[in-house]
């Protein structure tokens, strides 16, 4: 006991790498190795005591000349052999550290997904805000400037840009007006903005019979039904999204009118499909 090998012959096979090493030497717990650490460190004397396990009380490793220290320059030549069941191979907190790391990773991923996951941009057409009417008697033409109100809600945890709003108005399945607004606004996280837009419309030509209706003296309210169509284009993270809505709205073509928001939706009116 107490002998140490200064050199081990190199073998190509792991299975017989320790041929010639006596069981006594194996019990000593140290084996000479020609294999160097990957990082090639050759620092000061190691501070870890090497101990021989004999089944009885452990004694200081004689290979270290009883100092419990590895002489400088031998750290990369000596290999410790210890039982697999040794607790030092299984520090108690390893599982805890691993689980904590996994938990933190999952938590961070979850938070990233939660905050960055694209949520809906809600567009709600509120209704007609105002309608200003004028006539061309000679051409039997009606001009209606219709101002509409939209509520746009950003349900995301980041800002979105309302790139453009395109709107058109139909009467009797015929497009009578179009409008487009560009670079409108930026809506902050979890914020809502109300946007007004005006569509100039013209009721004329094959619908010029409407001039008679809209100017009829015997009628108090000259309500007509118009189909309002609106498309909102929003962008975030370079991604573009379009939300469209269409709604029948009631407009008085006989006089200038300002509506309570949503009021024009419930008036008793019609839309012929000529």
């Amino acid at each position: 006991m107490g002998k140490s090998l200064s050199h081990l012959p190199l073998h190509s096979s792991k299975e017989d790498a320790y041929d010639g090493v006596t069981s006594e030497n194996m019990r000593n717990g140290l084996v000479n190795s020609e294999v160097h650490n990957e990082d090639g460190r050759n620092g000061d004397v190691s501070q870890f005591p090497y101990v021989e396990f004999t089944g009885r009380d452990s004694v200081t490793c004689p290979t270290c000349q009883g100092t419990g220290r590895i002489p400088r320059g031998q750290e990369n030549q000596l290999v410790a052999l210890i039982p697999y069941s040794d607790q030092r191979l299984r520090p108690r907190r390893t599982k805890l550290y691993v689980m904590a790391s996994v938990f933190v990773c999952l938590l961070l991923s979850g938070l990233a997904v939660f905050f960055l996951f694209p949520r809906s941009i809600d567009v709600k057409y509120i209704g007609v805000k105002s309608a200003y009417v004028s006539y061309d008697v000679q051409k039997r033409t009606i001009y209606l400037n219709i101002t509409n109100t939209l509520n746009i809600t950003n349900n995301n945890y980041y800002s979105v840009e309302v790139e453009n709003i395109t709107a058109q108005v139909q009467f009797s399945k015929t497009v009578i007006g179009k409008a487009r607004l560009n670079n409108i606004t930026i809506i902050g996280p979890l914020d809502m903005k109300q946007i007004d837009y005006t569509v100039p419309t013209v009721i004329a030509e094959e619908m010029s019979y409407m001039y008679d209706f809209c100017t009829l003296i015997s009628i108090k309210v000259h309500n007509i039904v118009l189909m309002m169509q609106v498309t909102v284009t929003t962008t975030y993270f370079g991604h573009s999204e379009q939300i469209s809505q269409e709604r029948y709205q009631y407009v008085d073509c006989g006089r200038n009118t300002t509506y309570q928001l949503g009021q024009s939706e419930y008036l008793n009116v019609l839309q012929p499909q000529q």
Epitope: E205, E206, Y209, F213
Partner: antibody
């Protein structure tokens, strides 16, 4: 005042065709669409189709496609209804009327068509 | 096609009474509805257009009401000249269709 004058009664044989007219006066002819209706004896009213003199736009009830044809003579402000391949089911009074927003405000006196051999 | 269901089919009333005729559309027609009166051997005559507006020359005892799918024509204090057949008609989407008619006769 607005008037729609329809042509007189017709007695025709089965398989033949008939063309009736509706002459408009008292307003700008190209402004209002002209509607055509059928009323069988003692029965309700059925819409056949309409014609808009402004742009010659014609619309038909699916039931009368292939049976009815609407044409116009703008110089005389007259719209024509042509009925082909007549059968006894086509015996009825045919009305023309002027379209207005939410109703037909002026009606012709009607043209009676009798299909008999 | 939009179906128009008119009721009642016939009505026997006395002069001076008030009557209400109803018309139900199979879908929303947004008040695009006309009421007509037709007397024997005559052409129909427009009474009410756009559900609530009285046509020129129609007596004020006639009135139209309703919205969506339910509409009615009310005649207050019936006169002898009011007897005949009444039709409703929608003008919302082609084809326009008429109700089956309500025959109003003297009791």
């Amino acid at each position: 005042q607005v008037q729609l004058q329809q042509s007189g009664a017709e007695l025709v044989k089965p398989g033949a065709s008939v063309k009736m007219s509706c002459k408009a006066s008292g307003y700008t002819f190209t402004t209002f669409p002209i509607e055509w209706m059928k009323q069988s004896h003692g029965k309700g009213l059925e819409w056949i189709g309409n014609f808009h003199p402004y742009n010659d736009d014609t619309k038909y009830n699916e039931k009368f496609k292939g049976k009815a044809t609407l044409t116009v003579d703008k110089s005389s402000s007259t719209v024509y209804l042509d009925l082909s391949r007549l059968t006894s089911d086509d015996s009825a009074v045919y009305y023309c009327a002027r379209y207005f927003y939410g109703g037909m405000d002026y009606w012709g006196q009607g043209t009676s068509v009798t299909v008999s051999s | 096609d939009i179906q128009m269901t008119q009721s009642p089919a016939s009505l026997s009333v006395s002069v001076g009474e008030t009557v209400t005729i109803t018309c139900r559309a199979s879908e929303n027609i947004y008040s695009s509805l006309g009421w007509y009166q037709q007397k024997q051997g005559e052409s129909p005559q427009l009474l009410v257009f756009a559900a609530t507006n009285l046509a020129d020359g129609v007596p004020s005892r006639f009135s139209g009401s309703g919205s969506g799918t339910q509409y009615s024509l009310k005649i207050n204090s019936l006169q002898s000249e009011d007897f005949g057949t009444y039709y409703c008609q929608h003008l919302w989407s082609i084809p326009w269709t008429f109700g089956g008619g309500t025959r109003l006769e003297i009791k």
